[in-house]
């Protein structure tokens, strides 16, 4: 299953972790991928390693753990960000999480 | 034993394409990702291009993007590097590498095959 | 891209001695950092991957540290047969690179 914290909220100009917590007793994790809305933002292979969408590569940083940390935060940030498990041989879960970016007091 | 051999290598045109092959055996190929590594004459290493077990994420190096493409027949245990628009920088012995799964080690690799990129 | 800068580019160095070299990358890749061993006219041999694992079969003399942006090769008692080029490669992020190798040569 996947855990997630399904509302966050982060200040413009700031940071925030984008985190989903898979559990499972069985299932490994052969790859991560994390999404705003229909875009790509990242992509994690336990092969290959971390892929960063060419257009987010300066406010992605990868991490913690198998999350994104999203940086200078503006306000079209705000909306669905989605995370997909792909697991073996569990299958495919799927967690979202809605991001508010406010604007700075 | 573990073994790759690569094939395909020659001397070409700049602006033309070579298809380059890499045979696996002695060890479950579908289970694997696998990478494409280069190294100009005289020079030091580079990776070119990687690819998951399932073809499910691939990467390339800058300096091959949009002219490389590397694919993969799990029913065949081949690994194969596409080349189109080939310069002269393209020249160099290229080796198929398999990793330490899931730790990305290269740990077996092929002889190499040498690309030629001359007119 | 993360660049990896290894130094030194080369180093004379006597059967016994203890040689050091160092990779730095541009970004932090947390421990995904692989060291190889390459002859003459030979594939490239996998000392180290994960910073500091030491790959089965390659002698304990040879060892790796480091995380985040700086890692080390060690051969604690050169050899004869380590007189050879050793390059770093980084595994964390796509493209994965390498570094532009370190010649150890005899003195």
């Known amino acids: 299953t996947i855990d997630t914290k399904r509302n966050i909220s982060a200040e413009e100009g700031g940071s925030v972790i984008l985190q989903c917590h898979f559990s499972s007793d069985t299932a490994e994790v052969t790859q991560v991928d994390w999404k705003q809305q229909d875009q790509l933002l990242a992509i994690y292979s336990v092969d290959l390693g971390w892929h960063v969408a060419s257009v987010f590569s300066d406010r992605v940083v990868p991490g913690p753990s198998l999350g994104l940390t999203f940086q200078s935060l503006t306000m079209n940030d705000t909306g669905e960000y989605f995370c997909t498990y792909h697991t073996y041989p569990g299958g495919i879960y799927k967690g979202r999480i809605f991001l508010k970016v406010q604007e700075s007091s | 034993q573990v073994q790759l051999v690569e094939s395909g290598g020659g001397l070409v045109q700049p602006g033309r394409s070579l298809r380059l092959s890499c045979a696996a055996s002695?060890?479950?190929?579908?289970?694997?990702?696998m990478h494409w590594v280069r190294q100009a004459p005289g020079k030091g290493l580079e990776w070119v291009s990687g690819?998951?077990?399932?073809?499910?994420?691939?990467g390339y190096a800058d300096s091959v993007k949009g002219r490389f493409t590397i694919s993969r027949d799990n029913a065949k245990n081949s690994l194969y590097l596409q080349m189109n628009s080939l310069r002269a920088e393209d020249t160099a012995l290229y080796y198929c590498?398999?990793?330490?799964?899931?730790?990305?080690?290269?740990?077996?690799w092929g002889q190499g095959t040498m690309v030629t990129v001359s007119s | 891209d993360i660049q990896l800068t290894q130094s030194p580019s080369s180093v004379s160095a006597s059967v016994g001695d203890r040689v050091t070299i160092t990779c730095r990358a541009s970004?932090?890749?947390?421990?995904?950092l692989a060291w190889y061993q390459q002859k003459p006219g030979k594939a490239p041999k996998l000392l180290i991957y994960?910073?500091?694992s030491l790959q089965s079969g390659v002698p304990s003399r040879f060892s790796g540290s480091g995380s985040g942006t700086d890692f080390t090769l060690t051969i604690s008692s050169l050899q004869p047969e380590d007189f050879a080029t050793y390059y770093c490669?980084?595994?964390?992020?796509?493209?994965?690179?390498f570094g532009g190798g370190t010649k150890v040569e005899i003195k």
């Open positions: 490669q980084q595994a964390f992020y796509l493209p994965w690179t």
């Open positions: 002695g060890f479950t190929f579908r289970d694997y990702a």
């Open positions: 994960g910073a500091s």
């Open positions: 590498a398999k990793p330490v799964p899931r730790l990305r080690g290269l740990d077996v």
């Open positions: 970004q932090g890749i947390s421990s995904w």
């Open positions: 690819i998951t077990w399932n073809s499910g994420l691939i």
